[in-house]
Each structure stands twice: as C-alpha cells, then as structure tokens.
C-alpha cells in the first residue's frame, strides 16, 4: 500500500513510510485539541487489494470550551450550536438592556485545553439621564432623575406673555431609547404666526381664522376669469411663513380673433400683483391652467401678468 490516509482530527503514530506490505498495520492518535472516545478503531491495515481498510477520525472529538450560562436579561448564542474550539459565542441582551463587555467570545486552544477568549459580558438596564429642558416649555416627570427604557416624557409650551401663544414645533413625546439616548431631539416652543394671506382677484375659501398660527391651513379660489398661479392650499410653517408661498390669481386672456402673435416672453411685473410674503426675488413662473377648468376661456398666453378688475 502507498502512504496511509490523513485526517483532520487524528495523526499517524510514527513516521510514514513510502510503502507498506500487505497485512501491515498503522496506528493513529487524536491530534492536539481532540480527544478519543471509544469504541471506534483508530488503526488500519494494508489489505491484499493494496488498499487500506476503511478508517475514519470520527472517534476524535474536538475539545470544547466550558459551558457558558445566559447572562441575566440576555442570551448566549453559540455560533454553530457548538462549544468546540475555533467557534464563537455571541451575546445579546433583552430589549431594554445593553451589553457591557465583549459581544463575541472565541473558543481558543491554550495548550491542549479549550478556553474562552475573555470574560462573558453582562446585560445592564438601559437608563437615560433627564431629557433636555426647553425654553418657554416644560416636560412631564421633571422631578425624575433617571429614566428607564421606553419611559416617555411629553413636552408642552408655557402660556405666552403676549397675545399670541407659543406653538410646539416637533414631536411632543420622546422616549428613552436603545442606547440610553432619547428617541429624538426635544421640540421647541416659540410664537409662530403667519401674516394674513392676501390674494388679489381671489379669496380664501377655507381655514378662516382670527390669526394664523403653526400648521394653520388655508385654501383659495380665484374670481371668475382668473386662474391660480401657485398652490390653492398653503400651510403656516415653523418659520412663520406660508408654505408654499401665497398664490396669485392671474387674468385669463380673452381669445384672440386671428392666429396668436409671437410671444415675447417679457413679464409685466405690475405692482398690483404683489401680495404679502411674496418676497422671493425674480418673477414667479406663470402657469397655464388646463383649458377644461375654464370652459369658454382659452389658455392664457405665457408671461402675461394682469390682475386688473
């Protein structure tokens, strides 16, 4: 027979020879890091077919690291379901707890013994320091010094000293999150008041109010013979400006009797089309309304702004 087979878990006792005679026996032993569990054979014989009798290293078992218990409020998860050396142990904490120590330990061979690469971690309860204080507002549980996981606080604004109330900008409720960090930034309390939205040749049709505070929503429509340039719905944003800007109502041009003239694309910026808070520089685009919205009217010629009554 030629050289005997080699194995992952066991090695030949003695030096291998170039060839062996029929009937000759070779013995194996478990490699370092493996140990023998009877009764499987760990030897083989060169048979008369010039082949080695079947043998396997199934009798040699990997050394295993000591059993690790689940950490309190967490779990120890063996990577391949095994504690054998060369493998990893992963640690995870239950919701509301965080890991102190190594998230992964390695089962390593020290001499002929398998040991873990470090100490098992522990799971500590997630705790948050008190959330931020805000100007012109307060939060619930302001007397509490330590907050546990998912504990929530709700912010509210103080009464305003003037005629206009403080608006709460942002989410009113935040909670103590995963990494001992609050779920989001604290909201802000400030006076938000948008100007009265003036639309020439049009009028407000909903969202009427004495004053327009944060998130106030207003809708407009144009007078007959005018079309809306901009959005028909605007919302008072946190900067006390209308978003999108207050629209304009532009005149629908009468039908021309013959073929239309070439357009010059110059914009007549008649001051009568101005409305408050329309401070964007440069002329605003003029949109052609769909014809179907204005039966009996043609499309307006682009670039002509005219808002005479």
């Amino acid at each position: 027979c030629e050289e005997p087979p080699t194995f992952e878990a066991m090695e030949l006792i003695g030096k291998p020879k170039p060839y062996y005679e029929i009937g000759e026996r070779v013995d194996y032993k478990c490699k370092k890091g493996y140990f023998y569990i009877p009764p499987l054979a760990t030897h083989t014989i060169c048979d008369r077919n010039h082949t080695w009798l079947p043998v396997s290293d199934d009798a040699c078992y990997r050394e295993t690291c000591p059993y690790i218990r689940d950490p309190l409020n967490g779990q120890a998860v063996p990577a391949n379901g095994t504690y054998e050396f060369g493998y990893q142990m992963h640690f995870i904490c239950n919701e509301g707890y965080y890991l102190i120590g190594e998230e992964i330990l390695y089962c390593e061979l020290k001499g002929s013994v398998a040991i873990w690469s470090g100490k098992p971690p522990i799971c500590e309860k997630v705790l948050c320091t008190p959330p931020p204080k805000i100007k012109n507002g307060k939060h619930t549980f302001s007397e509490v010094e330590v907050f546990e996981y998912l504990d929530a606080v709700t912010y509210s604004c103080d009464p305003a000293p003037g005629p206009d109330p403080f608006s709460l900008i942002g989410e009113s409720t935040i909670y103590c999150g995963d990494n001992s960090v609050w779920s989001r930034a604290a909201p802000e309390c400030k006076v938000v008041k948008c100007r009265f939205p003036v639309v020439e040749n049009g009028k407000q049709i909903s969202g009427f109010g004495k004053k327009f505070y944060y998130k106030a929503t207003v809708m407009f429509e144009c007078d007959k013979g005018f079309y809306l340039d901009g959005s028909d719905t605007i919302v008072c944003d946190s900067n006390s400006t209308w978003d999108p800007p207050v629209p304009k109502c532009l005149k629908v041009l009468p039908p021309s009797s013959t073929k239309p003239p070439a357009l010059s694309h110059s914009v007549s910026t008649s001051s009568t089309t101005k409305s408050p808070a329309s401070s964007a520089s440069g002329p605003r685009p003029t949109y052609k309304p769909p014809v179907s919205n204005y039966p009996g009217y043609p499309k307006p010629e682009e670039g002509i702004l005219d808002s005479l009554d």
Epitope: F196, V199, K203, F208, T272
Partner: antibody, heavy 118, light 107 residues
Framework: EVQLVESGGGLVQPGGSLRLSCAAS????????ISWIRQSPSRGLEWLGV???????NYNSAFMSRFTISRDDSKNTAYLQMNSLKTEDTAVYYC????????????WGQGTLVTVSS | AIQLTQSPSSLSASVGDRVTITCRAS??????LNWYLQKPGQSPQLLIY???SLHEGVPDRFSGSGSGTDFTLKISRVEAEDVGVYYC?????????FGQGTKVEIK
C-alpha cells in the same frame, strides 16, 4: 411704538398732482405694512392701497391708475403719489400701519387734508 | 367690491341704554369683519377685530357677533363717551371696504 405722521396735503387744482408723505418715528417704516385710507363726507372711508414690508403693493382698483404707493427707507417715509386729481378726491388722507400683518387698522394718525378745487 | 351696509344710519340713545348696530355684507365674509369708532373731531379707532375680539383697551361693554353676511355690534350700557360714528370693515377680499357709518348720539 412707531408713530406715523402724514403731511403734504393742501389745495390743488383738478388735473393736478400731489405727493403725500407718511413719516415714521420710533421705528422703521420698512418694518411695517402701511396702508393709505381716505375719508370724505360724500364717500365715507375708502381704502386706497397698501405697501407691504417686502415692497410689494396692492391697490383698490378704483384708484390704481392714478395713485401709486412707494417707500424710501433712507428717509423712513412712505408716499402716496396722486395724479389727475378730481374734485371728488377732496378728503382727509390717513396713512395707517397694518396691525401685525393683519388688515386691522389700529394706528390712525391725524391725517392730512387734500382739497381739489379750481 | 364687497359692499357693507350699516343700519341704522343714525340713532339716539340715553346713557345706560343698550345699543345695537348691524352690518350686512353683499357676500359671505366669514368672520373677517372689524368695527371702528370715530369720535367727533378725531381719527377712527379700532374697537373690535375678527367679528368679536376686543382690541386692547376697549371696554367690555362693547361686543361683536355674527358670521357670513350679517354682523352686529352691541353696546350693553351706552356712555356719553361712546358718541360718534361707528364703521364696519371687511377684509376677506381686496379691496378692503368700509360701511357707510352709523352715527350714535346721546339724548
């Protein structure tokens, strides 16, 4: 608190022109929306137009072709330019600060009298 | 333009009387209506804004109500200093317009 004082009124012939001034003290004219309103026994109170803080204007269409509102920030003054004056333009003219961006007229001055007569 | 019609055009009341002035709009104006008082020899002064909100410094004997097209100004107990001409003003639509006025006298 800003005070607005009207001036420039007087006697003018029909077809003539006149420029009224509205001077601000105790504040900047550009920080406020300023309306012009007039009052006459025959026509009562009439809103003429407004100049907004951003410089934009809106007019009463009945006067738009003859009246123009402007502002000179360096002089801290708003103006009402009136052209082609008619006898029915005889009135007391007020400049008025629009209340905090809302069309409520809470700050009336004493007004300036314009008389259009030949 | 939206027309505002006030009634009565004038009235005479005794001190302590309850006075009611109405203002009717030619089309719906929601609550976008203000009231002014012009005392003899003075400029107008704002009394009430947005139909019913008292301007600062205005006595609470003044009250406003209404919505849409019909509005009312009430003086619960009229006083001598309340004489003058009362005007309503709408601001839902340009041009902003005023009523023709209601003259209030004390008997």
């Amino acid at each position: 608190e800003v005070q607005l004082v009207e001036s420039g009124g007087g006697l003018v012939q029909p077809g003539g022109s006149l420029r009224l001034s509205c001077a601000a003290s105790g504040g900047s004219v550009s920080s406020y929306d300023i309306s012009w309103i007039r009052q006459s026994p025959s026509r009562g109170l009439e809103w003429l137009g407004v100049i907004w803080t951003d410089g934009g204007t809106n007019y009463n269409s009945a006067f738009m072709s003859r009246f123009t509102i402007s502002r000179d920030d360096s002089k801290n003054t708003a103006y009402l330019q009136m052209n082609s004056l008619k006898t029915e333009d005889t009135a007391v003219y007020y400049c008025e600060r629009v209340y905090d961006g809302y069309p409520w007229f809470a700050y009336w001055g004493q007004g300036t009298l314009v008389t259009v007569s030949s | 333009a939206i027309q505002l019609t006030q009634s009565p055009s004038s009235l005479s009341a005794s001190v302590g009387d309850r006075v009611t002035i109405t203002c009717r709009a030619s089309q719906g104006i929601s609550n976008y209506l203000n009231w002014y008082l012009q005392k003899p020899g003075q400029s107008p002064q704002l009394l009430i804004y947005y139909t019913s909100s008292l301007h600062e410094g205005v006595p609470d004997r003044f009250s406003g109500s209404g919505s849409g097209t019909d509005f009312t100004l009430k003086i619960s107990r009229v006083e001598a200093e309340d004489v003058g001409v009362y005007y309503c003003q709408q601001y839902i639509k340009l041009p902003w317009t005023f009523g023709q006025g209601t003259k209030v006298e004390i008997k």
